[in-house]
């Protein structure tokens, strides 16, 4: 399965929308900075077969979609940008699901993948814990928005490496 060019464009559009969603200066939130322990190792891509890599990406986008679909998120971000962002993520999820269906026939997904998906879930669990701890303050959401932008940028490099492998 070739990850379509539209998926790459979708990723770029999602990043642009995330950037546009910023409402307050990140400099005013420096005291709220937090290391969420992004599982970089899961996106190194060396130990991965294609179906594994795609399912880890899918998990990350799914978790991002869930995070920005909450009531607290709706109360924080500008509605039209949030809707566009959700639509973009939904399209990416559909692309990746179509790819996984094709790839699973080609190769068995090893159990190793279970670890990677759980690592991504824990990462988002830490983000949710942080937001709860900070009572979903504007600065906490700003820190999370910046973190998701960073993780999307890193996963974008991962996707490009995947495409080159093809």
């Amino acid at each position: 399965c070739d990850l379509p060019q539209t998926h790459s464009l979708g990723n770029r559009r999602a990043l642009i929308l995330l950037a546009q969603m910023g409402r307050i200066s990140p400099f005013s939130c420096l005291k709220d900075r937090h290391d969420f322990g992004f599982p970089q190792e899961e996106f190194d891509g060396n130990q991965f077969q294609k179906a594994q890599a795609i399912s880890v990406l899918h998990e990350m986008i799914q978790q991002t979609f869930n995070l920005f679909s909450t009531k607290d998120s709706s109360a924080t971000w500008e509605q039209s940008l949030l809707e566009k962002f959700s639509t973009e993520l939904n399209q990416q999820l559909n692309d990746l699901e179509a790819c996984v269906i094709q790839e699973v026939g080609v190769e068995e997904t090893p159990l190793m993948n279970v670890d990677s998906i759980l690592a991504v879930k824990k990462y988002f669990q830490r983000i949710t814990l942080y937001l709860t701890e900070k009572k979903y303050s504007p600065c906490a959401w700003e820190v999370v928005r910046a973190e998701i932008m960073r993780s999307f940028s890193l996963s974008k490099i991962f996707q490009e490496r995947l495409r080159r492998k093809e």
Epitope: H34, M112, V114, D115, S116, A119, K122, E133
Partner: antibody, heavy 122, light 107 residues
Framework: EMQLMESGGGLVQPGGSLRLSCVAS????????MSWVRQAPGKGLEWVAS????????YYAPSVKGRFSISRDNSNNTLYVQMNSLGVEDTAFYYC???????????????WGQGTLVIVST | DIRVTQSPSSLSASVGDRVSISCQTS??????LNWYQQRPGKGPQLLIS???TLQSGVPSRFSGSGSGTDFILTIISLQPEDSASYYC?????????FGQGTKVEIK
Amino acid sequence: EMQLMESGGGLVQPGGSLRLSCVASGFTFKSFAMSWVRQAPGKGLEWVASVGSQGGSKYYAPSVKGRFSISRDNSNNTLYVQMNSLGVEDTAFYYCVKETDAVATMDALDMWGQGTLVIVST
Amino acid sequence: DIRVTQSPSSLSASVGDRVSISCQTSQSVNIYLNWYQQRPGKGPQLLISAASTLQSGVPSRFSGSGSGTDFILTIISLQPEDSASYYCQQGYITPYTFGQGTKVEIK
């Protein structure tokens, strides 16, 4: 009875390599992440590396990244660490440790072996 | 990396005394702070996980409290067998980091 038994320690020259093994018994090895933690004689504890329950999700301390490699064989209930380019600062007791969850982070180190001593010296 | 600062580095107390060891982290680790005991010549043993959860088989005189960045291990009534080194560790993210340790001696 739950047990972790390390082996493979010994004297090695700077720049040399060593492979440590740890055999687990008394619990479902394939369900838990495993770590290596070291302790230089008379010093504190330093986490070295962790591997997820299925052999994925490998994490390393900055001090060993690129030199050490953690792996596991669930069919033989065995954890390994391959240590290359060893330096005198790697001299320590190496403990094999069971984690409380399937992958590292947001958990604890709930069972420790007796440790194996690695001495890096000329 | 998350820095973990433990104090004091050593203490001497009498049997029956109440003893407290403090642990601070450089950023919030929520409740993911663990405490270990290491007796001389032995491997460490988990006493308390997730800030306050006592492990099975650990005497009830040990207790843990705190969340975020500030944590405390308390031994309510010190016993001779409690002579050991105690370490706190953040299990929130990797690299896992430990406090420098506190050596507890019996007077």
